[in-house]
């Protein structure tokens, strides 16, 4: 299953399959997730080691048993790959690292006014993988405001150095935020020239294209079909690059197929997995296990559940079958692709779905009438769980926020439905940033069921929580995916990085905002909060957040939306925007429904509604 916990001051011994430099443990974990054989990783922050060569070292590891012995190492961080973790699987990494220079091949230098502008330039340059920016206070005046675009053979820095007044980060192309746009076309009977960066075997051009998309240096590809004249080159997928970023030449060639990486697509990237099953095809590789199962789909599920399995063949040969069950060969290779592809066999083959980010149909957990005051504009995909709850009567308007917690589930505030309990009048918009982008053609979800907490009473602040079951499940994308829920009764975690988002008023007597707003707000203890609200009872099932001096808060139209906190690199839904005295007033924090206190209720309702477990714990 999915394991998300990080081990501090611990280092996994042995099992090394690759090593690289990464700026933090989360990026190291992402590289482990996308490496075909990595199950575990260990990361050495700069503070944990004196050896300059090993600083920022990210060590990717494999283990037949799925685990390795941990040794104590002060400052080291270790953890698991996020294979099998559904919507948490993403190659998108937005963080910017201050005081760090990520080294690589500098191929472009320009003057820009901010690190964000530098990241944007990197994202809009086809060859840029990461960048460094020298701030206005950099010690050498001639380098100030320099934006260096970089690449490396592996897509990660060749070295990382601690350097004051330098900020570094990665291209946001994997976040589907590139302005370049992509070529969806596949060209039959055409071979591209240029430099081959890798060679793998694939059953068709689609798998070849997806592998190219997620390979750090592949910009385009040529695939040799199973009818290609040279038998030893059949089903070969050549991953390619060039100095210019485009093929320098192409040659008409029967039974070849060429195309481009889809990494520069805007708003939509292919999933990093291959779900198609190939009948009459045998995938060769190292044998991991052989099991008897009923049907090729069960064979694929078995492969997906066995974390080291990369691909499989389900044999229908009479000698491989007993009654209704046949042999399911679970296999792996060094590069995650078959070492041999044979056609016309009595079997069907396919790939593990361990990197599919749709995951299962569950919500994610771990083991007012109140817009954002004092906030700033959000960017695409920053808060992909945020939804807009809109009511269409004569006109249509935004009323509340909400949080996507599963394919078919939204969590919001109960008071959003005061006087509007009819599910037919509601429209739920997900995967949006600007309300003005909504037209009559914009897809929306309709409500199948509104589940208001049984103890909620109108105009009282208690139990202000409601679940919405959508009529149809939503697909997950970089712009539309769920937020993880906290553990039941989560009281021990100290959250220091919390944000509230919404389209609500920007001042008490304001109006709904067009661009989704975000504001960083510290949590306030319940004791402190109670002092500020002496006329109300602040219960243990509430959580408060706000600045003593005010100025930043949720407001009307944000109700039902998320209060999320980042802990160990993972966002969790800590609160639901509920109520407050005015907006952003001095010493009047916002009050939020504490989600951890309602985990039993959420579990019960999401399970009973479907008759099967809807909750999944990555822990």
């Amino acid at each position: 299953g999915c394991l998300t916990q990080l081990y501090e001051n611990a280092f996994f011994r042995g099992g090394d399959v690759a090593s690289m430099y990464t700026p933090n443990a989360q990026y190291c974990q992402m590289r482990c997730t996308f490496h075909p054989r990595c199950l575990l990783f260990s990361f050495l922050p700069a503070s944990s080691i004196n050896d300059m060569e090993k600083r920022f070292g990210c060590f990717l590891k494999d283990s037949v048993t799925g685990t390795l012995p941990k040794v104590h190492r002060t400052g080291a961080v270790s953890g698991h790959s996020l294979k099998q973790c559904g919507h948490q699987i993403s190659a998108c990494h937005r963080d910017i690292y201050k005081g760090v220079d990520m080294r690589g091949v500098n191929f472009n230098v320009s003057k820009v006014s901010s690190v964000e502008e530098c990241q944007k330039r990197c994202t809009s340059n086809i060859r840029c993988q990461f960048f460094s920016y020298a701030t206005q206070t950099f010690h050498k005046a001639e380098y100030r405001n320099n934006c260096l675009l970089k690449y490396s053979p592996g897509g990660t820095p060749t070295a990382i150095k601690v350097l004051s007044n330098v900020e570094s980060g990665f291209s946001l192309k994997p976040c589907a935020l590139s302005e370049i746009g992509c070529h969806m076309n596949i060209f039959q009977h055409l071979a591209f020239s240029d430099v081959d960066v890798a060679r793998v075997l694939t059953p068709d051009a689609f798998v070849c294209r997806t592998i190219c998309t997620y390979h750090p240096n592949c910009l385009f590809f040529t695939f040799y079909t199973n009818v290609w004249k040279i038998e030893s080159q059949r089903n070969v997928c050549l991953l390619k690059t060039s100095e210019s970023g485009t093929p320098s030449s192409s040659t008409p060639q029967e039974n070849t197929i060429s195309g481009y990486s889809l990494l520069t697509c805007k708003r939509t990237l292919p999933e990093p997995c291959h779900s198609k099953i190939y009948p009459g095809v045998d995938f060769g590789g190292e044998e991991l296990n052989v099991t008897f199962v009923k049907g090729v789909n069960v064979c694929q599920e078995t492969c997906t559940k066995m974390i080291r399995c990369q691909f499989f063949t389900y044999s229908l040969l009479p000698e491989d079958c007993k009654e209704e069950k046949c042999k399911c060969f679970l296999r792996l290779s060094m590069d995650g692709s078959p070492t041999r592809i044979a056609y016309g066999t009595q079997g069907s083959s396919g790939y593990s779905l361990r990197l599919c980010n749709t995951g299962d149909n569950s919500v994610c957990t771990t083991k007012t009438s109140t817009r954002i005051v004092g906030g700033t504009n959000s960017s695409w995909g920053e808060w992909p769980w945020q939804v807009s709850l809109q009511v269409k009567l004569t006109a249509q308007r935004h009323l509340c926020g909400g949080s996507l917690i599963g394919h078919q589930w939204v969590l919001t505030a109960a008071h959003c439905f005061d006087g509007l309990p009819l599910q037919d009048v509601w429209r739920i918009y997900s995967g949006i940033l600007n309300l003005s982008d909504i037209t009559k053609d914009t897809p929306f979800s309709q409500i199948k069921e509104i589940i208001i907490h049984q103890n909620y009473k109108v105009s009282e602040g208690n139990h202000d929580i409601a679940l919405i079951k959508l009529q149809a499940p939503l697909n997950y994308t970089e712009f539309q995916k769920p937020i993880c829920l906290p553990s039941k009764g989560d009281t021990s975690t100290i959250y220091t990085n919390c944000w509230v988002t919404g389209w609500g008023f920007s001042k008490e007597k304001g109006e709904i905002q067009n661009i989704l707003q975000k504001v960083n707000i510290p949590l306030v203890t319940n004791e402190e909060c109670q002092k500020r609200y002496q006329d109300y009872k602040i219960t243990q099932r509430m959580v408060c957040a706000g600045y003593k001096e005010g100025g930043k808060d949720a407001c009307k139209g944000d109700s039902g939306g998320p209060l999320v906190c980042k802990h160990n690199g993972m966002w969790r839904l800590v609160g639901i925007t509920s109520w407050g005295e005015g907006c952003a007033r001095r010493e009047q924090p916002g009050v939020y429904t504490k989600v951890a206190e309602y985990m039993d209720w959420i579990l019960e309702k999401t399970q009973s509604s479907d008759g099967k477990a809807q909750m999944q714990s990555p822990a």
Partner: antibody
Framework: EVQLLESGGGLVQPGGSLRLSCAAS????????MHWVRQAPGKGLEWVSW????????EYADSVKGRFTISRDNSKNTLYLQMNSLRAEDTAVYYC????????????WGQGTLVTVSS | DIQMTQSPSSLSASVRDRVTITCRAS??????LNWYQQKPGEAPKLLVF???SLQSGVPSRFSGSGSGTDFTLSISSLQPEDFATYYC?????????FGQGAKVEIK
Amino acid sequence: EVQLLESGGGLVQPGGSLRLSCAASGFTFSGYIMHWVRQAPGKGLEWVSWIYPSGGWTEYADSVKGRFTISRDNSKNTLYLQMNSLRAEDTAVYYCARDAPGVGAIDYWGQGTLVTVSS
Amino acid sequence: DIQMTQSPSSLSASVRDRVTITCRASQSISTYLNWYQQKPGEAPKLLVFAASSLQSGVPSRFSGSGSGTDFTLSISSLQPEDFATYYCQQSYSTPHTFGQGAKVEIK
């Protein structure tokens, strides 16, 4: 030039049998997946069956499973469809078609042969 | 089996009109989606494969888009020779089902 030429169609009584042939030329027949697709009069296209290059793997639509058999003779560059226990609803134009390797489309079609099942 | 649903099933249009036909799959088929054109008395002809890739020799006024479950075939400026029936087909899993067809007629 790729050419596919179907033959063997005609009038047959319900319960009867018929064998369709498709002569292929202009490409290396032995390397390609081949399909049969049919179209009832005034209706849409219906995929019937396919066969892998070596003949080692075949698949059928549920509507013909157990009654139709696809086969090929690579030495003669010919594709066959043996149709048994024919029913009135099998009346259609039957097309022989070539699979486009690596992309899963049908890139070349024959002109079709009409099979009429009627008493 | 995967069901393919096309809409509209028929439409009337004039020369130089822009025409869009949609195809919806009952489950995600990635980009394993092809479009064919068929004229009366003729065999079908491949127009678009892999959802958006134009088959060699097909005029550039034809274009395809989509992935997952929703796909479209567009003709930017309808020509007299484009009046025909258009079929979508999925090749994601067998049986390789076709849509019911969309007939483009002269207005």
